[in-house]
Interface confidence: medium
């Protein structure tokens, strides 16, 4: 039975040209995290594998930095980066947990972080 929950940074906003940290946290389970995938709508951004470390998708090598931790840093933001991002936690023995983050990239200098929320 899957008892864990994914806590994410929820709805966040950032300035064009700036950076943002995408962060998820798996709690309420003793399952072992074997891999975390980061996806943007229909594309893979990166993978963090417990044994092998990080794989950054070639399309994003110049703009994505691993970490902190299992999170992901997105750099040189453009308005086109606005949209949904997903953290997919592969765990043993529970299976797969998915968290969602919505990022809005703003032209102006007004960029506030949204509240944290949980996805069971």
């Amino acid at each position: 039975m899957m008892t864990g929950t994914i806590e994410t940074t929820g709805n966040i906003s950032a300035e064009k040209g700036g950076s943002i940290i995408l962060q998820c946290h798996l709690s309420s389970t003793t399952a072992q995290v074997t891999q975390v995938n980061w996806e943007q709508q229909d594309q893979l951004l990166a993978i963090c594998n417990a044994d092998l470390g990080w794989h950054i998708s070639p399309s994003f090598k110049d703009r994505v930095a691993p970490g902190p931790g299992l999170g992901l840093t997105l750099q040189s933001l453009t308005v086109n980066d606005t949209g949904e991002y997903f953290c997919i936690y592969h765990t043993y023995p529970d299976g797969t947990y998915t968290g969602r983050i919505f990022l809005e990239v703003l032209e102006s200098s007004v960029a506030e972080h949204g509240a944290r929320f949980q996805i069971p």
Epitope: Q41, Q43, L44, N49, L52, H55
Partner: antibody
Framework: QLQLQESGPGLVKPSETLSLTCTVS??????????WGWIRQPPGKGLEWIGY???????YYNPSLKSRVTIAVDTSKNQFSLKLSSVTAADTAVYYC??????????WGQGTLVTVSS | EIVLTQSPGTLSLSPGERATLSCRAS???????LAWYQQKPGQAPRLLIY???SRATGIPDRFSGSGSGTDFTLTISRLEPEDFAVYYC????????FGQGTKLEIK
Amino acid sequence: QLQLQESGPGLVKPSETLSLTCTVSGGSISSSRYFWGWIRQPPGKGLEWIGYIYYRGSTYYNPSLKSRVTIAVDTSKNQFSLKLSSVTAADTAVYYCASSSAWYFDYWGQGTLVTVSS
Amino acid sequence: EIVLTQSPGTLSLSPGERATLSCRASQSVSSSYLAWYQQKPGQAPRLLIYGASSRATGIPDRFSGSGSGTDFTLTISRLEPEDFAVYYCQQYGSLYTFGQGTKLEIK
């Protein structure tokens, strides 16, 4: 355990398009665990990576073949495919489909020989 | 593009002997990104080692991998008749490349 099986014509004429399909069994092609790739091996020679696709549709190709290659995924059939256009005799090879963890290729099809000849 | 050079091209040994196969990269490769495969005639390659030193599922412990940076080694501690085959190293940097292979033949 994953099993992969290539299918498609064994003979293709020069300048035409080579088309192969890989059917995946023992697991879902929609798994975010895997990339789905193609590798080829000319007779008596070494291995050359062609490209891969992620289940969400993002692709990455060997730069030397990029202009001629298309890899697509059909999640409803648990298949992915390779198209290589404007083939020449140099494209004659055994073509393998394989699953990749992003770092290495862990499951392979048995391979299918494609000969380019008129 | 990272070029992998394997040596020797052919290695002639007898069953029971120790085999040492080398793979040298043209630039530094993360250990996580180095794998070894075995290929027998008419068969697909089979993953032996990943992450430079981790054995794949079902691979006997006589196979071991080591190395870092630009120099990697596959060692078969005591050759069995079924080990005679072609061995390839493979790396993942920004794209996948394979070495040209080492043929391990019976002496």
